[in-house]
């Protein structure tokens, strides 16, 4: 792919007007960014600051515990997925500031915007893995006692990452840079051109595998776990249960606009007014989905037992308490005791 290192005159003000007489002056429009783009920039800035710092802390705290604590493995992988996605934000931010001009070349166009989709698939597959782990702890405690170990957890994470990469490939392959003639601008986006069916297929697969199917399975999974929890009156685990629900719910809430607009755009003509309106909201939807990359550390902190008291402690210390303490609370993606607890204690807890 050519690298576009040319100077671009400032034609941001230009908006093509239909004129039969080509001698008539063209009306100029504002060179300012649209409101959705401004909102996207604000969200990106906040997500980048919170996401990089928060996830870096989570990685730092969990990395030392990952050898002996299974929950630390889950948290570590989720944090790595979020942290990786956050690294693309300065580039995406710069592009929006430049009215979506993409001066970073073809390779960056293929890789960087695909990171959020990699994050989506990695996160949901890891959440599914964690949920399966929670389910087994509740319903198959003896099996867990015999087979549930760090090695198996790492294998599960590797499978999740592998599948996530595999599912990201279509979007990666169809990303191209397009150099528009006027106003001079290089755009980074997906181009299916003749293959509208393939575009729809990719959007449907993304919606089903990255949203609807996980929503259905996780809802069923946590409904069963909730019923078991409530039937045994496990009051000690309700706070952590709220954390699990918060993490899973946040995933679906923040991905919803992106998924809805994505599926709609795949079924609309690119020149239709609805498509063009949705296209203007695209950056905002992406930024909204990006909130997922910074929300987990926030949930972990809020989930800390005796939260008010811990505010006096340093943030790494607080996160360590939340993520690695040997209690119900530290499992912020689950609501059972950690692996070092006995199975008897686990079954009592639920």
């Amino acid at each position: 792919m050519d690298s576009f290192n040319y100077t671009t005159p400032d034609y941001g003000h230009y908006d093509d007007k239909d004129t039969l007489d080509l001698n008539t002056p063209v009306d100029k429009t504002s060179n300012t960014l649209r409101v959705p783009d401004i909102l996207a920039l604000v969200i990106f800035a906040v997500v980048f600051l919170v996401g990089v710092l928060g996830n870096a802390l989570v990685v730092w705290v969990t990395a030392f515990e990952a050898k002996r604590t299974i929950n630390a493995i889950w948290f570590l992988n989720l944090a790595v997925a979020d942290f990786l996605s956050c690294l693309a934000l300065p580039i995406l931010f710069t592009s929006i500031v430049q009215h979506h001009h993409w001066p970073f070349g073809g390779a960056a166009c293929s890789i960087l915007p695909s990171l959020i989709l990699l994050n989506m698939y990695a996160s949901i597959l890891l959440l599914a893995t964690i949920s399966a782990d929670r389910f087994l702890l509740v319903f198959k405690p003896i099996w867990c006692q015999n087979f549930r170990g760090a090695g198996l957890a790492w294998i599960a994470c590797a499978v999740a990452w592998g599948l996530a990469l595999l599912l990201t490939i279509p979007s990666f392959l169809y990303r191209v840079v397009r150099e528009e003639y006027f106003p001079p601008k290089v755009l980074c986006g997906v181009d299916y051109s003749h293959d509208k069916r393939r575009e729809r297929a990719v959007a449907i697969v993304r919606l089903v595998l990255g949203f609807l199917w996980p929503l259905l399975t996780l809802t069923i999974c946590y409904t069963f776990i909730l019923l078991r929890t409530w039937s045994r009156r496990a009051t000690r685990s309700t706070k952590t249960l709220k954390v699990v629900v918060a993490v899973v719910a946040s995933f679906f809430i923040f991905w919803l606009p992106y998924q809805v607009t994505g599926i709609m755009m795949s079924f609309l003509e690119p020149s239709s007014p609805t498509f063009l309106l949705l296209k203007k909201l695209d950056s905002l939807c992406v930024s909204f989905a990006y909130i997922n990359c910074c929300i987990n550390p926030i949930i972990y902190v809020v989930a800390g037992q005796g939260f008010q008291g811990r505010l006096r402690k340093s943030l790494p210390s607080l996160l360590r308490n939340v993520l690695t303490e040997e209690s119900v609370v530290r499992e912020s993606k689950s609501f059972t005791r950690s692996t070092v607890d006995t199975m008897a204690q686990k079954t009592q807890a639920v």
Epitope: P9, Y11, Y14, D15, D16, K17, D18, T19, L22, N23, T24, P25, V26, H100, V176, R178, E179, E180, Y181, F182, P183, P184, K185, L187, D191, S193, P270, S271, L276, K279
Partner: antibody
């Protein structure tokens, strides 16, 4: 009325250079962009690039970046295209054509064309 | 580069008949501003090209209404409802959405 008058036919040897001219009349030269298009015998049209006479800004088709140089003389309302290191493949009819600029008309359409200049490269 | 594929390359019609020329682009020609910059030019024998239709379906000033353009995205069509003797020549589709600007190979319209 709007007219684009191009220079006469050129017969040159391989490796030489040639400078084609296109004199504009009937409109404000600096308000419109000047594009150059190549047409080989019996073939389609190829866009070489354009020049904004007002600012001197040029944009080339990557294919012609080392082949063509676009310039303009505002005082005489004339656009020029120099073709360097000519080969047999450069034998063609070259058209200058006008599009709206960033302030007048629309830069997307070629509404007026010159009559064309035939360039023949022969040893 | 955007490849513009015209079909047929040659077309022979009787006077008064309808002629239809197809043009397909290798990439979507929808600009980020929502417009589609697909145009049609006619080059009569021994002449320079003349501007016919801009942005898919808009006739340039002075172009008879028997000329009409249609299409969207990557597939476009030029129709001449009642062919007249003065319509013969080579018709080119062209795109100015993306750099470099590109043209189709041309469709030669001949009269029976």
């Amino acid at each position: 009325q709007v007219q684009l008058q191009q220079s006469g036919a050129e017969l040159t040897k391989p490796g030489a250079s040639v400078k084609l001219s296109c004199k504009a009349s009937g409109y404000t030269f600096t308000n419109y962009w000047m594009h150059w298009v190549k047409q080989r015998p019996g073939q389609g049209l190829e866009w070489i690039g354009y020049l904004n006479p007002s600012s001197g800004y040029t944009k080339y088709n990557q294919k012609f970046k080392d082949k063509a140089t676009l310039t303009a003389d505002k005082s005489s309302s004339t656009a020029y295209m120099q073709l360097n290191s000519l080969t047999y493949e450069d034998s063609a009819v070259y058209y200058c054509t006008r599009s709206g600029g960033d302030n007048y008309g629309n830069p997307y359409y070629f509404d007026r064309w010159g009559q064309g200049t035939t360039v023949t490269v022969s040893s | 580069d955007v490849v513009m594929t015209q079909t047929p390359l040659s077309l022979t019609v009787s006077l008064g008949d309808q002629a239809s020329i197809s043009c397909r682009s290798s990439q979507s020609l929808v600009h980020s501003n929502g417009n589609t910059y697909l145009h049609w030019y006619l080059q009569k024998p021994g002449q320079s090209p003349k501007f016919l239709i801009y942005k898919v379906s808009n006739r340039f000033s002075g172009v008879p209404d028997r000329f009409s353009g249609s299409g969207s995205g990557t597939d476009f069509r030029l129709k001449i409802s009642r062919v007249e003797a003065e319509d013969l020549g080579v018709y080119f589709c062209s795109q100015s959405t993306l750099v470099p600007l590109t043209f189709g190979a041309g469709t030669k319209l001949e009269i029976k």
